[in-house]
Interface confidence: medium
């Protein structure tokens, strides 16, 4: 058991053009309140229960009256947290719907009027006992900033609130076989009451001797991950050893999508594609007009002036779905060639190219020598991510445009002296050496080592290196 806590930080106009009108006016003062609905993200039982994990309603916020001519600011919020208690284990993956409601405080007959200002939804992974997670969601032109966490209620602890803790019986240590309860080091893990061998990470129990599995785990002791990879068919024979899914209905069998929505299976659950005018996890939310702000992620709502006429959301780039609720992962299509990295900027895709490539999709290879000139008789060599020039003697630089000092590399061996020459370099060898680079010692009897000196050159003469 535990509590899911939601802290609303701000609700106001989102960034960008098209700031929404203030929902309140001098003639119609109003105040906000919030509703949160939680569902186990991968759970089949959510089909029967709209908010299977629980729901909560906030207090009403301060009364707000718009200042004439002023843009809609962040609106005053209710005090305190929204708290959704959960009785069973925390599922780890959950779906949320957060609705922002407006309560109009004019002279309505029959009391205040309520209307839905914005609705955001999402799926998240969250371990109980962890820090606050921050989130920003947009609904039409509105932006909601909030934080959430799940915490266990004593004596439960752990990421799923399935382990139990009790105060220490002895001041110094826990009983035999029992560990201290981090982070409550002054408490001890309660004696195991689940079925012997029940996985402490993936199983839990509410009655002594039972072993109930968390989402994604199966087997009598919840030690087998649910997987269809080793089954004969997508829902083949059940086995604690293979870890196949239990035979029976698939996520889309019986179509959990209401109001004519179409169902498609995801790896461990399902997804509904809703007809116009309906949305929600199962297309269960209806009677929505453009005034309700049904288009998420900056989508533009047209039509739908009354609940009987369907609205249409025109989605910005990068989003799809009847309510622009689905982000298109355009980078998953791997549009960048040659190992470029993909950036989805929302309005456009960008490729960050590896060195040696260019173009919108990194499709141009800069490594090519085609059309690339190496000056002064140099030749182009491919490789290494950019063209390279192998320069003729006396030239250097990327394109062989720089005149090189042929003596810079000290080419004359054995103390020979180097002289730059229009056709290259000349080595004046020290006594006892000869050759183009003074590399050959002259034998004491006057004969040189191989190769022999060219005719007409005495050992010790300057050798021209052509």
């Amino acid at each position: 058991a535990g509590v899911f806590e939601l802290q609303i930080h701000s609700f106001g106009p989102g960034p960008g053009p098209g700031a929404p009108r203030s929902p309140c006016s001098a003639r119609l003062p109003c105040r906000l309140f919030f509703r949160v609905c939680l569902k186990p993200g991968l759970s089949e039982e959510a089909a029967e229960s709209p908010c299977a994990l629980g729901a909560a309603l906030s207090a009403r916020g301060p009364v707000y009256t718009e200042q004439p001519g002023a843009p809609a600011p962040d609106l005053p919020l209710p005090d305190g947290l929204l708290q959704v208690p959960f009785r069973d284990a925390w599922p780890g993956t959950f779906s949320f719907i957060i609705e922002t409601w407006r309560e109009e405080l004019g002279d309505q007959i029959g009391g205040p009027a309520w209307s839905l200002l914005a609705r955001v939804a999402g799926r998240r992974r969250l371990a109980a006992g962890g820090p606050w997670a921050r989130d920003i969601q947009r609904a039409g032109a509105w932006e909601l900033r909030f934080s959430y966490r799940a915490r266990c209620e004593p004596p439960a602890v752990g990421t799923a609130c399935t382990r139990l803790c009790r105060p220490r019986s002895a001041p110094s240590r826990c009983g035999p076989g029992l560990r201290p309860c981090a982070p409550l080091e002054d408490e001890c893990e309660a004696p195991l009451v689940c079925r012997a061998g029940c996985s402490p990470e993936h199983g839990f129990c509410e009655q002594p001797g039972e072993c109930r599995c968390l989402e994604g785990w199966t087997g009598p002791l919840c030690t087998v991950p649910v997987s269809t990879s080793s089954c004969l068919s997508p829902r083949g024979p059940s086995s604690a050893t293979t870890g196949c899914l239990v035979p029976g209905p698939g996520p889309c069998d019986g179509n959990p999508c209401a109001n004519g929505g179409s169902c498609s299976e995801t790896p461990r659950s399902f997804e509904c594609t809703c007809p116009r005018g309906f949305y929600g996890l199962r297309c269960e939310v209806s009677g929505v007009t453009c005034a309700d702000g049904p288009c998420f992620n900056g989508g533009l709502c047209v039509g739908g002036a009354d609940p009987d006429s369907a609205y249409i959301c025109h989605c910005p780039p990068g989003f799809q779905g009847s309510n622009c609720e689905k982000r298109v992962d355009r980078c998953s299509l791997q549009p960048c060639r040659n190992g470029g990295l993909c950036l989805d900027l929302g309005h456009a895709l960008r490729c960050r190219c590896r060195a040696g490539f260019a173009g919108p999709r990194c499709e141009h290879d800069l490594d090519d020598c085609a059309g690339r000139a190496c000056a002064n008789g140099g030749t182009c060599v491919e490789g290494g991510g950019a063209h390279r020039c192998s320069c003729a003697l006396g030239f250097g630089g990327r394109d062989c445009r720089e005149r090189a000092d042929p003596c810079a590399a000290r080419p004359c061996a054995h103390g020979g002296r180097c002289y730059a020459h229009f056709s290259g370099l000349v080595c004046a060898c020290a006594p006892g050496y000869m050759g183009a680079r003074c590399e050959f010692p002259v034998h004491p009897d006057g004969a040189s080592a191989l190769p022999a000196a060219p005719p007409g050159l005495r050992p010790g003469d300057p050798q021209r290196y052509l």
Epitope: Q334, C336, N338, L341, L343, R352, R354, D367, G385
Partner: antibody
Framework: EVQLVQSGAEVKKPGASVKVSCKAS????????MHWVRQAPGQRLEWMGV????????NYNQEFKGRVTLTVDTSASTAYMELSSLRSEDTAVYYC????????????WGQGTTVTVSS | DIVMTQSPDSLAVSLGERATINCRAT??????LAWYQQKPGQTNKLLIF???TLQSGVPDRFSGSGSGTDFTLTISSLQAEDVAVYYC?????????FGGGTKVEIK
Amino acid sequence: EVQLVQSGAEVKKPGASVKVSCKASGYTFTSYWMHWVRQAPGQRLEWMGVIDPSDSLANYNQEFKGRVTLTVDTSASTAYMELSSLRSEDTAVYYCARDSTVVAPMDYWGQGTTVTVSS
Amino acid sequence: DIVMTQSPDSLAVSLGERATINCRATKSISKYLAWYQQKPGQTNKLLIFSGSTLQSGVPDRFSGSGSGTDFTLTISSLQAEDVAVYYCQQHHEYPYTFGGGTKVEIK
């Protein structure tokens, strides 16, 4: 001298997560992308993803369906690969490999980290 | 994804003889193929990239050729230290993919 030193062997239970580290030295960490590759026993090498340490932009192999997360700590010149919802078939040697940033993809490799997934 | 197929799976060659390994891609990868050497207890070593460019520090008895879908790694004169498993890898597009490997031994 360029060196990539990886963290030690890990033994994990199915469903758990593992985080492997790769400490780089001998070059400017943020100037070179980092790839992660794994090799299951008797199997071919399998590319998992690449990250640019300068701003953490990454590209993942869709085969891993969101189970892989690549991160970096530039102050420690260290890259990390986290793999969640482990299965027995994730038992493998996991390598980090530096991207040369020119036409050659992976010019220096880590020594590998053995991850064993067993109940 | 591009599938890389290497042949043969293993190869036994006498010292000083030529060893040839082939790699085929299921679609054209232009020249963007790399070859790696894997030895037990050592880090993997890049030998060739872009089909035929020799990585610096690699002996010139290793050479690569080919483009499009068919590529070859040749060791012109096999040395004892060349005993290893060799992998090809396309670096044309993500996801990068590797061949199944060729084990080279001395006959």
